[in-house]
């Protein structure tokens, strides 16, 4: 199947040109989304390109310009928030970047009534993590891992943590591993529906292992960053949650939420914690060998003022043939009479599905059922729940955005997007206004990305928000690769794959191939979405062909797939990967004798055992920050996949998956290996390992470090990256300069 | 409670200015954000300007730079002088109050309404 076919014809070849690699460096062909930021059913906030914050009413068509351009860049504010009564606005600036999601900021508060910054009383800095209660305009804000109430923004704040020690005691943020593997928030505190109660999480580190590396800097002395950091098997993080009444926070102070006992019996994960009403929340927990999460719905006695816990409202999700849930356990979304709830899991057959959980889990009843997956529940009204899945034409890349009507019976369901710009729109994701009165879809391919609003109740669309026209023209002289989204079927198992091909593509001739690879486990890198990037170029102006493939261990497409790699991480997904390339070579159209393929992190990993696989398929390859043995990876993640690195679970799989064991295969390969030295995420240790086995057995190789980058290597980094790994490129499939 | 009574409609050609009025009940009237919407046949009531109760002021785009909100607490009065008038400002004109912030442009976040003031603006 064609997705984006190459606008060349003849009469038009002379005006039409390759892609340059300073185009993809430059950025010249990024696309924009928008995404509203709902403030009601129908108002939502947009910041404008001249930087004005606007409000704009759907029903009226109207909008206002609430804080000017010129009031932003008083303060130089890069970001905002509206408190949700909306007299105040925070100011965000001074963003310095932590680890994935965290981030300081210096905050100041903008009184809409008068027109003035609030004075008195401000806010330190740097602040580590900053809201708003969802009514009202009290705030919460953690400051050197201490979590601050205040009741209005001109009050003292009332100080609810003492115990925050950085490195140490993390309060209302996560540390290093909950952040990055666990919550996927720079925030742990969570803010009851009217701002009655604030639950918070407190993180322990002081047990935990540190990693230390030199950031050079430009001092004579380098700094040595030490970040608490459990790798497989290591001491974890101890997590406690708390709950405090915000309206009398002195009065019992924080009280805590009980763990389960069948989850305190050993070590343990906290997970994510849904509020359902201002006296009940919803809190799930893991088991440390994750393959056990019990999620237990807590009520506030008024009379003893703490948190009660009952077994009857304990809940236990299990896997018996790999991990629990997908990448992370779903969460739960209440419907109204905030005791049922809606959530993601396994089916009998082993497809993710939602379930509808009334009283226990296994009288579950299911609501979506088939051979494919549903992916996220978006939003649950009294009437309709709005999800996405893959379940269209069959092809599991895509994602479309269904309503089914709870309201009625039998339910029934339709497909909101499948049918509104079918060529160009087969990826979407949604936001919802207040109550899904409105909302949002944005397209993020495989055409040009599109953004619309919606009315939530006849799914008409009303206006488009964003499509992307300077984009469509600047395309319009650009001679595009062709991408096809196919499959393979090996051995009872379906091989997806995203070729990129040249835009003058011949099958009757050859050309080099580029595998490029993920595949770590619940991934998908064959995926129905539009981009113009650094492979994009390769076809295009150097005329290679590049394929993406999902093998054993990649998501949404049942468990059987995704569960193939469970505890023996590096097997399969290098198999499939080695299998799709012979699957290519028989289609007639690859030179044999260029094959290449390259990763980053995950990928790197496969990218390198797949060099070093023997079977003299690929010429050479490059891996970028990967990992090199699951002993130097977080805890959190390696044990979901590996279990322990214990002779009595699973130490022998971890010795037998290191690159390094690998090394002499490396001798018939050009090997390129790249890595950032301040790598707070896949430590650069991982690359020093391989140099090491490398050198060890007289393996010639091609190295490039970048000294202080993490694991994205950004700014300059980025263009000296790829600058680097064409060229390696180029040399390897002798094309000229 | 607060009662709002409009005045200073009528008909005026394009280009033409008009002053609208209102007069509020009640000695709170300083505590309230006040806002001017307005409402033409068959379509939804629109906001189209508000100010609070520090002074702030914020206008719909479409009559920036032609309307002007101010308020005199002293007097217990709104105003919105609209100058440049089009055809498609006719509307009848509703002063409305709110406790709390201006900064809410649904009709249905603003309790108290007067009876309305029409304007007509011919080409």
């Known amino acids: 199947i064609v997705l984006r076919p190459s606008r060349v014809h003849n009469s038009e070849e002379n005006t039409m040109r390759a892609l340059t690699l300073k185009d993809i460096l430059n950025g010249t062909f990024s696309y924009k989304t928008f995404f509203p930021n709902w403030i009601s059913g129908q108002e939502y906030l947009h910041q404008s390109a001249d930087n004005n914050i606007v409000l704009y009413n759907i029903e009226t068509g109207q909008s206002y310009t609430i804080l000017s351009n010129r009031t932003m860049k008083s303060v130089n504010a890069s970001n905002y928030g509206l408190s949700p009564d909306r007299q105040f606005v925070y100011l965000e600036s001074d963003y310095s970047k932590l680890w994935r999601y965290s981030y300081t900021a210096t905050y100041y508060i903008y009184d809409l009534s008068n027109g003035e910054f609030v004075r008195g009383n401000e806010l330190p800095r740097p602040i580590q993590y900053l809201c708003w209660s969802p009514v009202g305009s009290k705030l919460a804000y953690v400051y050197q891992n201490n979590i601050y109430l205040k009741q209005r923004p001109g009050d003292p704040p009332f100080q609810i943590t003492f115990n925050g020690r950085e490195n140490k005691i993390f309060n209302g943020i996560p540390d290093w591993v909950y952040e990055e593997e666990m919550l996927a928030t720079k925030y742990a505190l969570w803010w009851s529906p009217n701002g009655k109660f604030l639950a918070y999480a407190e993180f322990n580190d002081t047990d935990i292992p540190v990693i230390a590396y030199s950031y050079y800097g430009d001092e004579q002395y380098p700094r040595t960053i030490n970040i608490p950091y459990p790798k497989a098997g290591a001491k974890n993080p101890v997590v406690r949650i708390f709950i405090i009444d915000t309206t009398y926070p002195a009065y019992v102070g924080p009280q805590e939420v009980p763990v389960p006992a069948m989850i305190a019996s050993s070590d343990y994960y906290f997970s994510w914690l849904t509020w359902v009403t201002d006296e009940r929340v919803c809190l799930q927990w893991l088991k440390r060998v994750q393959n056990v999460s019990v999620l237990s719905i807590c009520d506030f006695r008024e009379d003893w003022q703490t948190w009660d816990c009952p077994k009857t409202q304990e809940h236990i999700e299990e896997s018996r043939t790999g991990w629990a849930g997908g990448f992370f356990v779903s969460t739960p979304v209440f419907s109204y009479d905030a005791i049922s709830y809606y959530k993601i899991f396994s089916d009998k057959d082993g497809y993710k599905h939602i379930h509808y959980i009334k009283d226990t889990v296994e009288n579950a009843i299911q609501i979506t059922s088939g051979k494919w997956e549903a992916i996220n529940i978006f939003r649950v009204t009294q009437d309709s729940l709005f999800y996405s899945s893959n379940e269209f034409e069959e092809y599991p890349g895509r994602r479309n955005i269904y309503r089914i009507s709870i309201g009625s019976y039998p339910p029934s369901k339709k497909c909101v997007t499948c049918h509104l710009r079918k060529e160009r729109c087969q990826y979407y994701t949604a936001s919802f206004s207040d109550y899904a009165k409105y909302y949002a879809l944005v397209c993020y391919g495989p055409g040009i990305p599109i953004s619309t609003l919606h009315d939530g109740r006849t799914d008409q669309e009303i206006k488009i928000l964003e499509e992307n026209k300077e984009l469509e023209n600047a395309l319009k002289n650009i001679q595009l690769p062709k991408e096809e989204i196919k499959k393979l079927e090996v051995d009872e198992i379906t091989l997806w794959y995203k070729m990129i091909l040249p835009p003058q593509f011949d099958r009757s001739k050859k050309y080099p191939l580029l595998i490029q690879v993920y595949g770590g486990p619940c991934s998908q890198s064959v995926r129905s979405v539009f981009a113009v990037n650094w492979i994009s170029y390769l076809a295009s102006k150097e005329g290679m062909v590049i394929a993406l493939v999902d093998g054993r261990g990649t998501a949404f497409q049942g468990d059987k797939l995704l569960y193939a790699v469970y505890r023996k991480l590096g097997v399969y997904e290098v198999e499939d990967q080695i299998t799709a390339v012979r699957k290519f070579i028989e289609m007639g159209f690859i030179d044999e004798k260029r094959i290449a393929i390259w990763g980053w992190s995950y990928g790197g990993y496969v990218s390198s055992l797949a060099l070093a696989s023997g079977t003299g398929l690929f010429k050479c390859g490059i891996a970028v920050a990967p990992v090199s043995s699951w002993e130097y990876y977080a805890s959190v993640y390696t044990e979901r996949f590996m279990g322990l690195p214990t002779k009595d679970d699973n130490l022998e799989h971890y010795k037998n998956s290191t690159v390094m064991a690998r090394a002499e295969y490396f001798r018939n390969v050009d090997y390129l290996l790249i890595h950032g030295t301040a790598d707070d995420n896949v430590h650069f240790q991982n690359s020093a390992q391989i140099a090491k086995a490398l050198v060890n057995a007289q393996v010639d190789f091609q190295a490039m470090w970048y000294s202080d980058q993490n694991h994205g290597l950004s700014g300059l980094s980025t263009n000296h990256l790829y600058t680097h790994m064409t060229h390696f490129l180029k040399q390897c499939f002798s094309l000229s300069d | 409670q607060v009662q709002l009574q409009e005045s200073g409609g009528g008909l005026v050609e394009a280009e033409g200015s008009l002053r609208l009025s209102c007069i509020a009940s009640?000695?709170?009237?300083?505590?309230?954000?006040m806002g001017w919407f307005r409402q033409a046949p068959g379509k939804e009531r629109e906001l189209v300007a508000a100010i609070s109760t520090g002074g702030s002021t914020y206008y719909a785009d479409s009559v920036k730079g032609r309307f002007t909100i101010s308020r005199d607490n002293a007097r217990n009065t709104v105003y919105l002088q609209t100058n440049s008038l089009k055809p498609e400002d006719t509307a009848v004109y509703y002063c409305?109050?709110?406790?709390?912030?201006?900064?809410?442009?649904?009709?249905?976040?603003?309790?108290?309404w007067g009876q309305g003031t029409q304007v007509t603006v011919s080409s």
């Open positions: 409305a109050a709110r406790r709390g912030s201006a900064y809410y442009t649904n009709h249905v976040d603003w309790p108290y």
């Open positions: 009640g000695r709170t009237f300083g505590t309230y954000a």
